[in-house]
């Protein structure tokens, strides 16, 4: 297993949509063709896996159908967009990116993205 | 170094607005987030919001929301705060600071905005 | 909105000796997400403490923060004459993001 660099950003807001997108971008020693890639969520020091997908390079990325991640990949960066979140989910995200094939097998783990969540204020309510 | 470098001191009429500029050196401005802190004269200090550069969305105080408006210049590392309908309850010194993982730093070295008929 | 209450207001104290501050919030806050701050006069705040017990880089040993929940704590072990200042706590738990009132530590 050889060491790999990850670079995601240190801090995104998601929308008040609860939607959040933020690139993870590795270097690449060598060609791979097969990447995998898993954002884990730490909070409060448990982590606990968000999503995984596994791609072969110049392909989407296919996550599970009920998978709350969906991510586009270009060259050494991976695109990742999370939806559904609420203020409860704010938390560090981390990205992991495997090089599966060819070998040697290259492990990198992001320091993680900060995301912040917040609830939209509920609506008044409105006598009509 | 990191560094946020805030614009100068303003003077306003009530019921003007002012803008307050903070440039950000030493760092991937993109990756973090700024916000805007507030400090009346001899009082504690007041969160206002904050803005993540990394995609401008913004969270602001309830109780300035609709007068606040802040924003990122990617291309020259910049932040703005904009407060309009300004009252004399206004007058403070205003801070930007880097908003990281679960911390403010470094701030700003501050603007004094006077709110004054 | 979380409310953050610090005790006490003032505190008078000697170099030397130690400085123990309250920050008590009104709703449970993640330890991750509890800072301090210290404020002297016509200063900006210097980050001190983030997720409530590390020490923020160029800090001196002599800061430590603790605590969980609803109740943290910031020590200073030998107040030194760069220490008297105004410090302040924060949460970063749930919007709107809150400080304290602030505590005044001032030379006896």
């Known amino acids: 297993c050889k060491a790999m660099h990850v670079a995601q950003p240190a801090v995104v807001l998601a929308s008040s949509r609860g939607i959040a997108s933020f690139v993870c971008e590795y270097a690449s020693p060598g060609k791979a063709t097969e990447v995998r890639v898993t954002v884990l969520r730490q909070a409060d020091s448990q982590v606990t896996e968000v999503c995984a997908a596994t791609y072969m390079m110049g392909n989407e990325l296919t996550f599970l159908d009920d998978s709350i991640c969906t991510g586009t990949s270009s060259g050494n960066q991976v695109n990742l967009t999370i939806q559904g979140l609420r203020a409860m989910d704010t938390g560090l995200y981390i990205c992991k990116v495997e090089l599966m094939y060819p070998p040697p097998y290259y492990l990198g783990i992001g320091n993680g993205t900060q995301i912040y969540v917040i609830d939209p204020e509920p609506c008044p309510d409105s006598d009509f | 170094q990191v560094q946020l470098v805030q614009s100068g001191a303003e003077v306003k009429k009530p019921g003007a607005s002012v803008k307050v500029s903070c440039k950000a050196s030493?760092?991937?401005?993109?990756?973090?987030?700024i916000s805007w802190v507030r400090q009346a004269p001899g009082q504690g200090l007041e969160w206002m919001g904050w803005?993540?550069?990394?995609?401008?969305?913004?969270n602001y105080a309830q109780k300035l929301q609709g007068r606040v408006t802040m924003t990122t210049d990617t291309s020259t590392n910049t932040a703005y705060m904009e407060l309009r309908s300004l009252r004399s309850d206004d007058t403070a010194v205003y801070y930007c600071?880097?908003?990281?993982?679960?911390?403010?730093?470094?701030w700003g070295q501050g603007t004094l905005v006077t709110v004054s008929s | 909105e979380i409310v953050l209450t610090q005790s006490p207001g003032t505190l008078s104290l000697s170099p030397g000796e130690r400085a123990t501050l309250s920050c008590r919030a009104s709703?449970?806050?993640?330890?991750?997400?509890l800072a301090w701050y210290q404020q002297k006069p016509g200063q900006a705040p210097r980050l001190l403490i983030y997720?409530?017990?590390s020490r923020a880089t160029g800090i001196p040993d002599r800061f430590s923060g603790s605590g969980s929940g609803t109740d943290f704590t910031l020590t200073i072990s030998r107040l030194e004459p760069e220490d008297f200042a105004v410090y302040y706590c924060?949460?970063?738990?749930?919007?709107?993001?809150?400080f304290g009132q602030g505590t005044k530590v001032e030379i006896k």
């Open positions: 600071a880097r908003v990281g993982a679960n911390w403010f730093d470094p």
């Open positions: 030493g760092y991937t401005f993109t990756s973090y987030g």
């Open positions: 803005i993540s550069a990394y995609n401008g969305n913004t």
């Open positions: 709703q449970s806050v993640s330890s991750s997400y």
């Open positions: 997720g409530a017990s």
């Open positions: 924060q949460q970063f738990g749930s919007s709107p993001w809150t």
